[in-house]
Interface confidence: medium
């Protein structure tokens, strides 16, 4: 038997992926475990093999279909179970009634690019990936810029309270290397959380013209 406290957390990417993390204090390291998804109103079910991500936590992705297919709706409830093999049997270790649109975490924004750069400002655009059409414009973004000599954690957060897939960064220093990241969150869902940060976009401001004030 497996003792200890268990935590089972899953998020839906709004299209065709449910990502789950199961942590269990005192779990057996050599036990084979999986997540089983049983939707209450769909004629399919899905499993994924839990793989270790740390000493006491495992993760897996339930791939429900093609990346941009709308596999679940706001009314779906998916029974998610962690099943671990005990001899010839599977034992239910954790269970939750998962409401996909209450537990959203979108994919990180993609295709970041510099639209226009000057000495003191830079206009950057991006795209959202695999986001449901249900959201329409009900999304918000956070962005951060990494300045020389600082860490990402020190970077101030810029909040965009609407679906705006671009930003104009102001008051930058000329001829300086920066990095930029953005993340997205739907306004819907009691347990919805921010997407992962995008891959950083590196850019350099233009040098100031000689003889001009900076």
């Amino acid at each position: 038997a497996v003792n200890g406290t268990s935590q089972f957390t899953c998020f839906y990417n709004s299209r065709a992926n449910i990502s789950c993390v199961w942590s269990q204090d005192g779990a057996l390291q050599d036990t084979s475990c999986q997540v089983h998804a049983w939707p209450d109103r769909r004629r399919w079910n899905q499993t994924c093999e839990l793989l270790p991500v740390s000493q006491a936590s495992w993760a897996c992705n339930l791939i429900l279909g093609a990346p941009d297919s709308q596999k679940l709706t706001t009314v779906d409830i998916v029974t998610l179970r962690v099943l671990c093999r005990e001899g010839v049997r599977w034992r239910v270790m954790a269970i939750q009634d998962f409401k996909p649109f209450e537990n959203l975490r979108l994919m990180a924004p993609i295709s970041l690019q510099v639209v226009h750069v000057e000495t003191h400002r830079c206009n950057i655009s991006w795209e959202i990936s695999q986001a449901s059409h249900y959201f329409e414009r009900h999304l918000e973004f956070e962005a951060r810029t990494l300045s020389p000599g600082h860490t990402w954690e020190e970077a101030p957060l810029l909040t965009l309270k609407q679906k705006q897939e671009w930003i104009c960064l102001e008051t930058l220093t000329p001829d300086t290397q920066y990095e930029f990241q953005v993340r997205v969150k739907p306004l819907q869902g009691e347990f919805t959380t921010w997407s992962p940060w995008s891959q950083p976009l590196a850019f350099r401001t233009k040098p100031a013209a000689l003889g001009k004030d900076t």
Epitope: R41, R43, V75, T79, L80, D97
Partner: antibody, heavy 119, light 106 residues
Framework: EVQLLESGGGLVQPGGSLRLSCAAS????????VHWIRQAPGKGLEWLGA???????QYNAAVKGRFTISRDNSKNTLYLQMNSLRAEDTAVYYC?????????????WGQGTLVTVSS | DIQMTQSPSSLSASVGDRVTITCQAS?????LYWYQQRPGKAPRLLIY???NLASGVPSRFSGSGSGTSYTFTISSLQPEDIATYYC?????????FGQGTKVEIK
């Protein structure tokens, strides 16, 4: 064979409480969601709420806070606890289960139990 | 909440007649069901997911529609079809039913 059997109905005074039971057989309540639906005399059907296979509940806002759905897995039985009852809660109360998927609609119904709220 | 409006609220037809009931939703729904309720009995599922016949249901019953407009048809009314018929949506919570259509024999 899937069967649902409600009990616990009767006459209750306004402001009183009542607990209805729904005994399930032919399936496990930990594998299917079960719903409560009522029908006032001569009126239509009103969905009250559900308890899902994992044990979480969902309610119609019209009764949320007054009605509570629970279950006893060992008895394979569902409950509807009704508090602060009003005359307009007078109805036949049904428990119902969908087919293998909710996609299939309410394929299984109990026979209903009558609740009368009157002084 | 999604309002489901059935019409007519009652109808009287002869044995063998074709009977049609409509159900209008206040917004688009994607999962629609039809139930039959005989006097003093629990409802019985007839049609699931708009047009699929539930197990054991005679083929004279059928359903169609999409979006906000749905239709239920009895191709040849039989004496045992005397009942009230309800539509129900399962596209959003709370689940809602139509107010019912009472079918009688002339």
């Amino acid at each position: 064979e899937v069967q649902l059997l409600e009990s616990g109905g009767g006459l209750v005074q306004p402001g009183g409480s009542l607990r209805l039971s729904c005994a399930a057989s032919g399936f496990s309540v930990t594998s299917y969601g079960v719903h409560w639906i009522r029908q006032a005399p001569g009126k239509g059907l009103e969905w009250l709420g559900a308890i899902w296979s994992g044990g979480s509940t969902q309610y119609n806002a019209a009764v949320k806070g007054r009605f509570t759905i629970s279950r006893d897995n060992s008895k394979n039985t569902l409950y509807l606890q009704m508090n602060s009852l009003r005359a307009e809660d007078t109805a036949v109360y049904y428990c119902a289960r969908a087919g293998d998927y909710n996609y299939d609609g309410f394929a299984y119904w109990g026979q209903g139990t009558l609740v009368t709220v009157s002084s | 909440d999604i309002q489901m409006t059935q019409s007519p609220s009652s109808l009287s037809a002869s044995v063998g007649d074709r009977v049609t009931i409509t159900c209008q939703a206040s917004q688009s729904v994607s999962f629609l069901y039809w139930y039959q309720q005989r006097p003093g009995k629990a409802p019985r599922l007839l049609i699931y997911d708009t047009s699929n016949l539930a197990s054991g249901v005679p083929s004279r019953f059928s359903g169609s529609g999409s979006g906000t407009s749905y239709t239920f048809t009895i191709s040849s009314l039989q004496p045992e079809d005397i009942a009230t018929y309800y539509c129900q949506q399962w596209s959003t919570y709370p689940l809602t039913f139509g107010q019912g259509t009472k079918v009688e024999i002339k």
